[in-house]
């Protein structure tokens, strides 16, 4: 699997989409997991509804939500209030029994908010920022890792 990069703005929502063959994965629940190191396990963050027919219902774990369009074949994960610690490698998975097929490998990148003064010593108030609403990037930007790009930092 190639790794697809999704970029989101700190403090905003990031939507990650994972397309799949709806016939091949018919009846299967899906999951979103975080890759722990290059060879480490993929730690489950959130999974779709226990009843496959209700997969369209949004399920949430903290700031991460998941919903599955089983007919269209698109799994959608939403990361709300994106933070720097959310950056990293993830997988969309299709579950069958105790096994999991990888639908897509994802790298989440968190960009600094252009309006984020970051300085706790600043005097930012939201009421003075409302006029800049259009500057907030609500959608995600995605691309595939180019050949030769290193998905994980080399281990020493």
């Amino acid at each position: 699997h190639n790794t697809t990069v999704f970029q989101g703005v700190e403090g905003q929502s990031l939507q990650v989409s994972c397309p799949y063959d709806s016939m091949k994965h018919w009846g299967r629940r899906k999951a979103w997991c975080r890759q722990l190191g290059e060879k480490g396990p993929c730690q489950r963050v959130v999974s779709t509804h226990n009843l496959w027919l209700l997969s369209f219902l949004r399920r949430r774990n903290g700031s991460t939500a998941i919903t599955d369009d089983t007919l269209g074949g698109t799994l959608t994960i939403t990361l709300r209030n994106l933070q720097p610690h959310d950056a990293g490698f993830y997988q969309c998975q299709s579950l069958h029994g105790s096994e999991a097929d990888t639908l897509r490998k994802v790298l989440v990148e968190v960009l600094a908010d252009p309006l984020d003064h970051r300085d706790a010593g600043d005097l930012w108030v939201p009421g003075e920022s409302e006029s800049f609403e259009d500057a907030h990037v609500e959608h995600s930007i995605s691309r595939s890792l180019l050949e030769g790009e290193i998905p994980f930092p080399p281990t020493s």
Partner: antibody
């Protein structure tokens, strides 16, 4: 432990001046915005003024604008409030507080001093 | 300026009973970018400076007992003490942290009945 200690209060005649100080310890003063809030005897809280960590930005309540000046000396970990043209209605306990700010949070006041009483009377 | 109006002015509640304080802002303090309400609550006990209890309308400050909870959105907010304790006797203030100038409500005095 965060400590804020106000000083400089006292009795002053209408039209007079006073300078309040707030000595800070227990946190990195130079990275925190600071504020003054006052409370007239038996009354509620009134925000007075605020200053950013680098002193590049200041705000004032309309009731004190043009008369009060907020400043800070990060090398001395001290916040100041210069009060000129004082009026009877400025009589209050003046609190200095550290301001939890930055993007997303907005200004809330998370640590307070014990306050210093300013009485404006002839 | 945003005007903050609290009600009631005072409240007498029996120990262990629920206390509810209301706060209304003259304009919305909801920031559409992150869907957070910029409304804080403070507690001031007699002879002491105020203490931050809640910000973003419902986020408890670290160390604040969970009997204190905040709710509401837009212009109407509530502070609830689910089971009043003797140490909760104080004046409670709401504060908008949405725009300068920062403004406080007039305060609500909570006493034991």
């Amino acid at each position: 432990e965060v400590q804020l200690l106000e000083s400089g209060g006292g009795l002053v005649q209408p039209g007079g001046s006073l300078r309040l100080s707030c000595a800070a310890s227990g946190f990195t003063f130079s990275t925190h915005a600071m504020t003054w809030v006052r409370q007239a005897p038996g009354k509620g809280l009134e925000w007075v003024s605020a200053i950013s960590a680098n002193a590049g930005k200041t705000y004032y309540a309309d009731s004190v604008k043009g008369r009060f000046t907020i400043s800070r000396d990060n090398s001395k970990n001290t916040l100041y409030l210069q009060m000129n043209s004082l009026r009877a209605e400025d009589t209050a306990v003046y609190y200095c507080a550290s301001l939890r700010g930055g993007y997303e949070v907005g200004p809330t006041f998370d640590s307070w001093g014990q306050g210093t009483l300013v009485t404006v009377s002839s | 300026d945003i005007v903050m109006t609290q009600s009631p002015d005072s409240l007498a509640v029996s120990l262990g009973e629920r206390a509810t304080i209301n706060c209304k802002s003259s304009q919305s303090v909801l920031y559409s970018s992150n869907n957070k309400n910029y409304l804080a609550w403070y507690q001031q006990k007699p002879g002491q400076p105020p203490k931050l209890l809640i910000y973003w309308a419902s986020t408890r400050e670290s160390g604040v007992p969970d009997r204190f909870s905040g709710s509401g959105s837009g212009t109407d907010f509530t502070l609830t003490i689910s089971s009043l304790q003797a140490e909760d006797v104080a004046v409670y203030y709401c504060q908008q942290h949405y725009i300068w100038p920062i403004t406080f409500g007039g305060g609500t005095k909570v006493e034991i009945k």
